[in-house]
């Protein structure tokens, strides 16, 4: 007889018969007959397979090497892989999350605009007229220069992007 | 895609005999694994018989083993089901069924399509 051309969802064709995929989390061991099932066979420890499939070997779960910063975020099972993210510090140098660099910090006359995640670096920005940074720092953000008016000060010496202004008593007028 | 229709049921005395025979409409009737299941009233549909796509291999259920035949005939698009030493057991709503997929001959899931059915009654 002619073979089906087509097979229908979860099915493949093989050997002029559709046979039925092996489910999420099992490998294929035998072809289906005409009058007998598909043999799948559940992946093993440390394996997963995560789509209907045809395949012989299930894939092994990917290593959150420590040596390169990663750590487990979340364990695989038999039908998904494991998810490595970054120890603190730390973030992910691809989408992949394969390795880890340090997180960036904003130098002096910079500031933190956001703070890095496991998966994103520090974002810096230059710090305004008006606020300074004086430290390399992955989580400082710009500081306003101190007001010396409130204080009942005058300002002694003008602030900069890197420093804060100096405060100073106000002069006193002798008569 | 294939539509089936039975046709043959009727009333029949304990010990006669009958032929079902299912008409499949639609192309490559040959490329369908066919079967017979039925229903008796008020309970699960059971599986009968089932032919390969070729006509060579047949299974059938222990209770018609040596009284009931399948046979097709490809150049018909037709399936058939020869019983005879009919029983009152017998009695129920004979369905022709096609799948494409392996499966074993039994498991009702595998079948794609189904036909309306044809009543078969073994009485005297």
């Known amino acids: 007889p002619e073979p089906p051309t087509a097979c229908r969802e979860k099915q493949y064709l093989i050997n002029s018969q559709c046979c039925s995929l092996c489910q999420p989390g099992q490998k294929l061991v035998s072809d289906c007959t005409e009058f007998t099932e598909t043999e799948c066979l559940p992946c093993g420890e440390s394996e997963f397979l995560d789509t209907w499939n045809r395949e012989t070997h299930c894939h092994q779960h990917k290593y959150c090497d420590p040596n390169l910063g990663l750590r487990v975020q979340q364990k695989g099972t038999s039908e998904t892989d494991t998810i490595c993210t970054c120890e603190e510090g730390w973030h992910c140098t691809s989408e992949a999350c394969e390795s880890c660099v340090l997180h960036r910090s904003c130098s002096p006359g910079f500031g933190v605009k956001q703070i890095a995640t496991g998966v994103s670096d520090t974002i810096c920005e230059p710090c305004p007229v008006g606020f300074f940074s004086n430290v390399s720092s992955a989580f400082e953000k710009c500081h306003p220069w101190t007001s010396c008016e409130t204080k009942d000060l005058v300002v002694q010496q003008a602030g900069t992007n890197k420093t804060d202004v100096v405060c100073g008593p106000q002069d006193r007028l002798r008569a | 895609q294939v539509q089936l229709v039975e046709s043959g049921g009727g009333l029949v005395q304990p010990g006669g005999s009958l032929r079902l025979s299912c008409s499949a409409s639609g192309r490559a009737f040959n490329t369908y694994t066919m079967a017979w299941f039925r229903q008796a009233p008020g309970k699960e549909r059971d599986f009968v018989a089932a032919?390969?796509?070729?006509?060579?291999?047949?299974y059938y259920a222990d209770s018609v083993k040596g009284r009931f035949t399948i046979s097709r005939d490809n150049s018909k698009n037709t399936l058939y089901l020869q019983m005879s030493s009919l029983r009152a057991e017998d009695t129920a709503v004979y369905y022709c069924?096609?799948?494409?997929?392996?499966?074993?001959?039994?498991?009702?899931?595998?079948?794609?399509?189904w036909g309306q059915g044809t009543q078969v009654t073994v009485s005297s």
């Open positions: 032919i390969s796509r070729d006509g060579t291999i047949t």
């Open positions: 069924a096609a799948r494409r997929v392996g499966a074993v001959p039994e498991r009702e899931s595998a079948y794609e399509h």
